[in-house]
């Protein structure tokens, strides 16, 4: 019998300085582009090599971005979220939610799947 897969959810404030090529990541999500079932939140889909986010090291693919410079990302159209990041200025503060997969149950059995993917 497989063990149960649980997720440890943590929040973190990440302050990024916009680099020469920007912040260095891609996003998915929004009210018109639900990436996760029943969740119109904004998620990190790609961290660009040598970009500001990658060099900082804390933002991860799969993270949910809750706010940008204190502005909530709830109930935004996808393009409105993109524009918010693009107009966020040089110093950008991100409130993010990390989901860490943890395994409960019999040792040696790994759960499969990630509802966020």
């Amino acid at each position: 019998m497989n063990g149960r897969v649980d997720y440890l959810v943590t929040e973190e404030e990440i302050n990024l300085t916009r680099g020469p090529s920007g912040l260095g990541f891609n996003i998915v999500g929004g009210t018109d582009q639900q990436y996760v079932s029943n969740d119109s939140g904004i998620y990190v889909s790609r961290i660009k090599e040598n970009g500001a986010a990658a060099l900082d090291g804390r933002l991860q693919e799969g993270d949910k971005i809750l706010s940008v410079n204190g502005q909530d990302l709830k109930n935004l159209l996808h393009q409105d979220a993109v524009d918010l990041f693009r107009n966020a200025g040089y110093a950008v503060s991100l409130r993010v939610q990390h989901r860490l997969q943890v395994q409960n149950g019999p040792i040696g059995h790994r759960g499969e799947g990630d509802p966020s993917g």
Partner: nanobody, 127 residues
Amino acid sequence: QVQLVESGGGLVQTGGSLRLSCAASGRTFSTYTMAWFRQAPGKEREFVADINWNGGSTYYADSVKGRFTISRDNAKNTVYLQMNSLKPEDTAVYYCAAAIGSTVDSYYHSDPLEYDYWGQGTQVTVS
């Protein structure tokens, strides 16, 4: 892992038309930014066109503007490149590329590094 498979290439006379297709795997195709690049023998890979997740925004290289049209059908997980008024200088291997999501940065359309996944290419020859 995303897989991209191009089709529709071939030999066509100057002034003719071709329609390339790129079929993508993955249930989240509707979130991908998609693009076409091309590479002629002895030359670097060159950006042709791209399209955002819902088809609402497209961008073209100057060399193909007004002749080529990029489009997508998210229900079919497919992106297309309609090529009209073809010229001998359009001869190349045409590659489909995908990036998951939308960049939050000012977009470097022509940079292959913006894209994570690539097809094997389809040959287009204009005689």
